[in-house]
Amino acid sequence: DGCKDIFMKNEILSASQPFAFNCTFPPITSGEVSVTWYKNSSKIPVSKIIQSRIHQDETWILFLPMEWGDSGVYQCVIKGRDSCHRIHVNLTVFEKHWCDTSIGGLPNLSDEYKQILHLGKDDSLTCHLHFPKSCVLGPIKWYKDCNEIKGERFTVLETRLLVSNVSAEDRGNYACQAILTHSGKQYEVLNGITVSITERAGYGGSVPKIIYPKNHSIEVQLGTTLIVDCNVTDTKDNTNLRCWRVNNTLVDDYYDESKRIREGVETHVSFREHNLYTVNITFLEVKMEDYGLPFMCHAGVSTAYIILQLPAPDFR
């Protein structure tokens, strides 16, 4: 059939909860292409009917929820004008009850479910939730050894759990939980994460570099919406947190009630020697109280700020 076969790594998944896999293989999927999902070399494509438990949603295959019998090799066929690629994804589903047995007994878990915290540092864990736009995710709750995590050393920020002054006792089994809503139905997503610790700096003690902002002021009209990116380069192995703060408080906490100013979801682009991270701050409506206040982008030990100022009056 002229399609080039590409074999992806195995995915090991938990039954009875939603799962999605996006058929992207840059640069193949960057142009005008059609994507079709199949199971176990079947000639019949996966359904595109959104009521189906397993269906294709744009370039994604979506399981609502995943069941034990869904194990197998799935293929997505990417057809371009002059090309065809068939990507094979081996999905293995297991029955997992996070609180009954140790996740450590599963040696081939995806690396997303094995994370490392650095002793004595401020570090973070990430809840990897990969779903199409049709899935709405609620707030994330974090658990350690089946108990909800509370305490001043822990802060939930978007999909991350920030851990300050990591100690040896922070190692062990964690889980992050979110409610996913799709077509009016709700599903629970629970990801187990084994967390190990290290004293190693890992990134050689390098200091992240904030490319933008550069400790400057921005002219902005009262009442307007403003989005400012913080762009940071850092080594691939870094453990640095990147966030926006005002008055030494995370902006999401400082504006917790009004939610007028929010931090965006961090994204990054990977280069050979480093990563370029972007995390933005959104002012839904600039108010008088925002002027003259330094809004700080933090990246590890590096900081840079912006100060909003009213535009100079135009006397023309």
Epitope: P107, G120, S196, T198, R200, Y203, K236, D237
Partner: antibody
Amino acid sequence: QVQLQESGPGLVKPSQTLSLTCTVSGASITSGYWNWIRNHPGKGLEYIGYISYSGYTYYNPSLKSRVTISRDTSKNQFSLKLSSVTAADTAVYYCATGGYDYVEDALYYWGQGTLVTVSS
Amino acid sequence: DIQMTQSPSSLSASVGDRVTITCRASSNVRYMYWYQQKPGKAPKLWIYLTSNLASGVPSRFSGSGSGTSYTLTISSLQPEDFATYYCQQFTTSPYTFGQGTKLEIK
């Protein structure tokens, strides 16, 4: 069960490059830290360096100018190259990894070691 | 670099003796790791995070210490304990081992 196995020539000529490979089973080298350590005859252990889950490498400064650690994730192997060797590099070379009780620095899994002799 | 100095370098003792090996660091370290090595064998993790015994290590072994001074203690020496013991720190690079303490039968 995690297992590590060193392989490579047991005899290297002075000024040449020592090359060893560690093959890992039971764990993925894209998780954790993968270390090289050597034991000089009749002397103690010396930490050479590591390659991390992301491919970051750390080398002992005393060897940094001569050492390279790399990996092949498709084969689940990581390698050590030590250039310009002398008789002082004669040692048993070990690969090792941690993760015991969720502590990456607790080097619980070791290869059996391979003796490399530098001699003409 | 943090220098790790073990004392004694060698020690002759009898079965049933209480033995203490000391590891001194030239600067503060957060945790200490201890390894046991027998001739012709790879080292084995013995004690981690200063005081935790690795799997299979008998309870007659214990570890303690903080800052620059750490100890490995054997409460009642057994024939299988005769080996070389190394301390190691991962707090500051370069990650250094002690020179080893060889425990021999008297």
